[in-house]
């Protein structure tokens, strides 16, 4: 069988290429109630069964575990710890299982876990140590290479009194455990900003998806250290312009492809550098589709077709001449 055929959805074959600890080791061919198991495909599917906790009697052979569409609510520490450990588990999909809390060490004792999908769970409480497992300043490296966290933002009334962006970033950076992470998807999370230190501490990233958020600016974000970055998805945000520093950093990444569609670009004098860059660069995919949203007179104009004469700023009037 082959690896997962899509980066963000697990196939029934081996990925890529692969609660209290149970007292009794499960029988090799045992399959938990409400689940479907295939030893040949090393796959267990417990899908849309309204499970409220992770089954304790998972077979030791499991490589791909689907626990989607359940009602798990809380993922406690050691939720997948077993005796013997689930040493082969490489792909874990928990999407759409109504998780609102993931506690410290929830994924401990999974030495081969390469892919984790927590998408479509309203994570009001994601422990800073959910992925690192400990509060040490430097934790043991996590084996994760792909982390899918699309649409994990809880409804406004369920959020803690803290920045949601900050909560997610704290979990990504704790203990520097995710140094080997290659794919990170954070789409559809209402992010208003990207904390400036997050990317610098994920040096192995090859694919970063920040699409369908509310990012207004990348001014304080540095991409300089992401020398392996191959795709950067920034579609469907609230970006108005990319400034020189960002443009230079993106241009300096050797393998990058950037996706910028459906942002409300402001085509005034501040856009001149970006337009010049767009005309010369090959890193932006579909750059001919980028259009102005503001000011009104420029709406729907194609960025690539603009020249410096088009990009003016209304003079700022001294206070005495300003009208209400």
């Amino acid at each position: 069988s082959s690896p997962t055929s899509s980066a963000s959805s697990f196939s029934s074959s081996a990925p890529f290429l692969a609660s209290a600890v149970s007292a009794q080791p499960p029988l090799p061919d045992q399959c938990p109630a409400l689940c479907e198991c295939s030893e040949a495909a090393r796959t267990v599917k417990c899908v849309n069964r309204n499970l409220t906790e992770v089954p304790t009697d998972l077979p030791a052979y499991v490589r791909n575990l689907f626990l989607t569409g359940n009602q798990l609510a809380v993922l406690p520490a050691g939720a997948f710890a077993r005796r013997p450990p689930l040493a082969e588990l490489a792909a874990l999909n928990l999407s759409g299982s109504r998780l609102d809390e993931v506690r410290a060490g929830a994924f401990e004792h999974l030495p081969s876990l390469r892919q984790l999908d927590l998408s479509h769970n309203p994570l009001a409480d994601l422990s800073p140590f959910a992925f690192s497992g400990s509060n040490a300043s430097v934790s043991a490296p996590s084996p994760l290479v792909e982390l899918i966290l699309n649409h994990i933002v809880p409804p406004e009334d369920e959020r803690q009194n803290r920045s949601f962006e900050g909560m997610v970033v704290a979990a990504l950076l704790a203990g520097r455990a995710l140094q080997g992470l290659r794919r990170l998807e954070l789409a559809s999370n209402h992010f208003l900003y990207l904390p400036r230190d997050v990317l610098a501490q994920l040096p192995s990233l090859r694919h970063l998806d920040l699409s369908n958020n509310s990012l207004v600016s990348l001014t304080y974000v540095s991409f300089r250290n992401l020398t392996h970055l191959e795709s950067l998805h920034l579609e469907d945000n609230a970006l108005k312009v990319l400034h020189n520093g960002t443009l230079a950093e993106l241009q300096g990444l050797p393998h990058i492809r950037v996706f910028l569609d459906n942002n409300p670009w402001v085509c005034d004098c501040h856009m001149a550098d970006m337009v010049t860059w767009l005309k010369e660069t090959e890193v932006v995919q579909g750059k001919d589709r980028l259009t102005c949203a503001y000011p009104e007179k420029m709406r729907n104009r194609v960025l690539l077709e603009l020249n410096s004469a088009d990009l003016d700023c209304d003079p700022i009037l001294p206070p005495s001449l300003q009208t209400s």
């Epitope: 997962t4 980066a7 890529f16 290429l17 192995s204 090859r206 694919h207 392996h228 191959e230 492809r257």
Partner: antibody
Framework: QVQLVQSGAEVKKPGASVKVSCKAS????????MHWVRQAPGQGLEWMGR????????NTNQKFKDRVTMTRDTSISTAYMELRSLRSEDTAVYYC?????????????WGQGTLVTVSS | DIVMTQSPSFLSVSVGDRVTITCKAS??????VAWYQQKPGQAPKLLIY???DRYTGVPDRFSGSGSGTDFTFTISSLQAEDVAVYYC?????????FGGGTKLEIK
């Protein structure tokens, strides 16, 4: 099952060009990178470059930058590699190989290889 | 480019013996190393990736270890069908590069 089937052997003269095709089946073509790796007779493996089937973006080994073009046709799930200005040292078996978007450069399935002989 | 130095280049071993091949990278490549097997007249086959992950369907007599610059590939008990050339490859940075290969034959 996954298969990568390459075009047949070619004999070319120095200075000519060769275009090798690789038809994929048994998986979603646009979910995997397609790479080209060559192996001279009795020698090791050398990565030439890759193409991203979903957008056609390429990443090429600097050694071949000026001579190689990698393309794909998603409608027929086929990748192509054209090598120009052939010289005798380009005589090799040329393989296409796929990788996931995450592993990037681990090649889990390979074509059967296409022998290109460059001789005057 | 990162240079992968593989040793030995040739190995003659008896069936049932343990086989160890090493690969040294010219700079740290984390755990981004794969091992391939190539039999005569065939394309290479992926055996190990991320230094130690066994690819689907690969017998458990094949294993890999290492991180940083030093990597080891092991066949715990050589079988006759394991006669082949084995290559290491780094996936840390582009261009990916291969070791020179280790030709394994039965004594």
């Amino acid at each position: 099952q996954v298969q990568l089937v390459q075009s047949g052997a070619e004999v070319k003269k120095p200075g000519a060009s060769v275009k090798v095709s690789c038809k994929a089946s048994g998986y979603s073509f646009t979910d995997y990178y397609m790479h080209w790796v060559r192996q001279a007779p009795g020698q090791g493996l050398e990565w030439m470059g890759r193409v991203s089937p979903n957008n056609g973006a390429t990443n090429t080994n600097q050694k071949f930058k000026d001579r190689v073009t990698m393309t794909r046709d998603t409608s027929i799930s086929t990748a192509y590699m054209e090598l120009r200005s052939l010289r005798s040292e380009d005589t090799a078996v040329y393989y296409c190989a796929r990788s996931t978007m995450i592993t990037s450069y681990y090649f889990d399935y390979w074509g059967q290889g296409t022998l290109v002989t460059v001789s005057s | 480019d990162i240079v992968m130095t593989q040793s030995p280049s040739f190995l003659s071993v008896s069936v049932g013996d343990r086989v160890t091949i090493t690969c040294k990278a010219s700079q740290s490549v984390s755990t981004d190393v794969a091992w391939y097997q190539q039999k005569p007249g065939q394309a290479p086959k992926l055996l190990i990736y991320f230094a130690s992950d066994r690819y689907t369907g690969v017998p458990d007599r094949f294993s890999g270890s290492g991180s940083g610059t030093d990597f080891t590939f092991t066949i715990s008990s050589l079988q006759a069908e394991d006669v082949a050339v084995y290559y290491c490859q780094q996936d840390y940075s582009s261009p990916p590069t291969f070791g020179g290969g280790t030709k394994l034959e039965i004594k």
